[in-house]
Interface confidence: low
Amino acid sequence: KGMHVAQPAVVLASSRGVASFVCEYGSSGNAAEVRVTVLRQAGSQMTEVCAATYTVEDELAFLDDSTCTGTSSGNKVNLTIQGLRAMDTGLYICKVELMYPPPYYVGMGNGTQIYVIDPEPCPDSD
């Protein structure tokens, strides 16, 4: 059966361009190896924002140069996307894959609409 993935419908990024949300997946049994991918959907195009594989023993680890950070706890993954600007406003989809042990399962959330508002420039002080 397709794995259910839940994520919030809407998140507002902070003034510093940071957005956090929880991605929760439902599965029977504990996967030893899980891969989480954040995809951004713009129209019919889907692009990968970041991805990380984690195991029961190891913490969720994105690449050093990734725009994402995260922590995992059971079937929940706390994702944080950094460096967002107004132009990055869009639908961010959480894809979860249970890689090991078999069987392979994959699920995609309905997406989190992240709104990013560029901060107003500070007025010059005389």
Partner: antibody
Framework: EVQLVQSGAEVKKPGASVKVSCKAS????????MDWVRQAPGASLDWIGN????????SYNQKFKGKATLTVDKSTSTAYMELSSLRAGDIAVYYC?????????????WGQGTLVTVSS | QIVLTQTPLSLSVSPGEPASISCSAS?????MHWFQQKPGQSPKSWIY???ILASGVPDRFSGSGSGTDFTLKISRVEADDAGVYYC?????????FGTGTKLELK
């Protein structure tokens, strides 16, 4: 280019064992599970099981437990399937197969097949 | 285990005509994968993840479906399409293949 090259056809006597090899090249052997599939003459495909070459952990179709044993030799990037207590019902072509992508599971690459015949 | 039943068992189609093969699963699956096999050859990945054509597969082919009912369609059959087509599920172990559908040309 990903290649899976299997050992040649075998003719065995009933009760004997046979070990079929599948040599992998063109990718990092330990990155992908190796699955094995059976096709009896004129029949559909039957999944036997798979092995994770990295951890050497296996998953078997209950139907083939005790019949097939899957192993790997990481040093030569070769997967093996041993069939024991052979009988006429084991006559088939046996394939090794590998997923097409680390994160999307489907059998994209197949060996050429090894015909195992059991005859007294 | 999930049983995959293909219909029809065989079909004979004239070149240029459409063709359709169904695969019914005994319980819901996430994706369906399809393979083509010609006599004396290994199976070839044909359509994966329900609707994605494998490399080199002509766009006359398409895959669709969800839950328990999946379909492989050919818009205009050509001589090279002859062979046996198998569906396969990987949602639960043991992995299972369909009964196969033999496509012949008239």
């Amino acid at each position: 280019e990903v290649q899976l090259v299997q050992s040649g056809a075998e003719v065995k006597k009933p009760g004997a064992s046979v070990k079929v090899s599948c040599k992998a090249s063109g990718y990092t052997f330990t990155d992908y599970n190796m699955d094995w599939v059976r096709q009896a003459p004129g029949a559909s495909l039957d999944w036997i099981g798979n092995i994770n070459p990295n951890s050497e952990s296996t998953s078997y179709n209950q139907k083939f437990k005790g019949k097939a044993t899957l192993t790997v030799d990481k040093s030569t990037s070769t997967a093996y399937m041993e069939l024991s207590s052979l009988r006429a019902g084991d006559i088939a072509v046996y394939y090794c197969t590998r997923d097409g992508n680390r994160y999307d599971a489907w059998f994209a690459y197949w060996g050429q097949g090894t015909l195992v015949t059991v005859s007294s | 285990q999930i049983v995959l039943t293909q219909t029809p068992l065989s079909l004979s189609v004239s070149p240029g005509e459409p063709a359709s093969i169904s695969c019914s699963a005994s319980s819901s699956v996430t994706y369906m994968h399809w393979f083509q096999q010609k006599p004396g050859q290994s199976p070839k990945s044909w359509i994966y993840s329900t609707s994605i054509l494998a490399s080199g597969v002509p766009d006359r082919f398409s895959g669709s479906g969800s839950g328990t009912d999946f379909t492989l369609k050919i818009s205009r059959v050509e001589a090279d399409d002859a062979g046996v087509y198998y569906c396969q599920q990987r949602t639960s172990y043991p992995l299972t293949f369909g009964t196969g559908t033999k496509l012949e040309l008239k």
